[in-house]
């Protein structure tokens, strides 16, 4: 059986442009190396937001310039995306790959619709 990935349907970003959600996968095997990718789907275009590979039991580390951070616990990954603006509203898909040992397994979530509302500028005070 292929791998199942679950993620929330909808998340609202904070006023500071931060959105967090959990990506959970049902691992069919005893993977030691897992890759998690967040993809954004707009129309038929799919772009990579961020990706991280981690060893089971170790922390999830994204690249220094990544807009994502995350922590892992068992078969759950807690993902946080920051620096979001209204134009970034869209469907964010969690993709999980069991990289090692073979066989490779793929799991793709149905996506989390992240809504981002830009904060109103503060009115000038006299």
């Amino acid at each position: 059986k292929a791998m199942h990935v679950a993620q929330p349907a909808v998340v609202l970003a904070s006023s500071r442009g931060i959105a967090s959600f959990v990506c959970e996968y049902a691992s069919p095997g005893k993977a030691t190396e897992v890759r998690v990718t967040v993809l954004r789907q707009a129309d038929s275009q799919v772009t990579e937001v961020c990706a991280a590979t981690y060893m089971m039991g170790n922390e999830l580390t994204f690249l220094d310039d990544s807009i994502c951070t995350g922590t892992s616990s068992g078969n759950q990954v807690n993902l946080t995306i920051q620096g979001l603006r209204a134009m970034d509203t869209g469907l964010y898909i969690c993709k999980v790959e069991l990289m090692y040992p073979p066989p490779y397994y793929l799991g793709i979530g149905n996506g989390t619709q992240i809504y981002v509302i830009d904060p109103e500028p503060c009115p000038d005070s006299d």
Epitope: K1, A2, E33, V46, T47, E48, T53, I93, Y105, L106
Partner: antibody, heavy 110, light 101 residues
Framework: GVVQPGRSLRLSCTAS????????MHWVRQAPGKGLEWVAV????????HYGDSVKGRFTISSDNSKNTLYLQMNSLRAEDTAVYYC????????????WGQGTLVTVSS | QSPGTLSLSPGERATLSCRTS?????LAWYQQKPGQAPRLLIY???SRATGIPDRFSGSGSGTDFTLTISRLEPEDFAVYYC?????????FGGGTKVEIK
Amino acid sequence: GVVQPGRSLRLSCTASGFTFSNYGMHWVRQAPGKGLEWVAVIWYDGSNKHYGDSVKGRFTISSDNSKNTLYLQMNSLRAEDTAVYYCARGERLGSYFDYWGQGTLVTVSS
Amino acid sequence: QSPGTLSLSPGERATLSCRTSVSSSYLAWYQQKPGQAPRLLIYGASSRATGIPDRFSGSGSGTDFTLTISRLEPEDFAVYYCQQYGISPFTFGGGTKVEIK
């Protein structure tokens, strides 16, 4: 090219327009008049590779991301390795192949 | 993959079947013409690839999948392959040849 059984051959495939390290890169082959057979994949930064059962231990996939070039080192070649070999790019949403090379015919014969 | 060969006339409907050993929706369909590399038609069992006409549609889940060509055009006569990509090794079906009756 034509190569004798037991000998070695290295295939290469150079791509442009995308960054190798963002994708899984694959080799797929097709024996004359037959169907498609997946051969091997190299993932992202190159640290993980997976192979089809028929080539495991004989073929090695590698890449040079700085050159956007994919390689397939084929050792201990057999007559049944005769095929057109395609390089192919796995898509972001999975290892289905949206871009294919034109293919190169490898004939193993004495 | 079944049938091995499908003999049909232009304008007819073609229904191709694929049964996989892996239960998932990670299934793709390709079209291949003689002397050419395969061309991606469908991924994720039912999503059309970019530039593929809407006469091509994919359906199914679990282990049983179908590719339907609603009205065959002359350029649709070719060999069609399914492929599962949920678990390595990524296996292809044996192919179905759609030929002119």
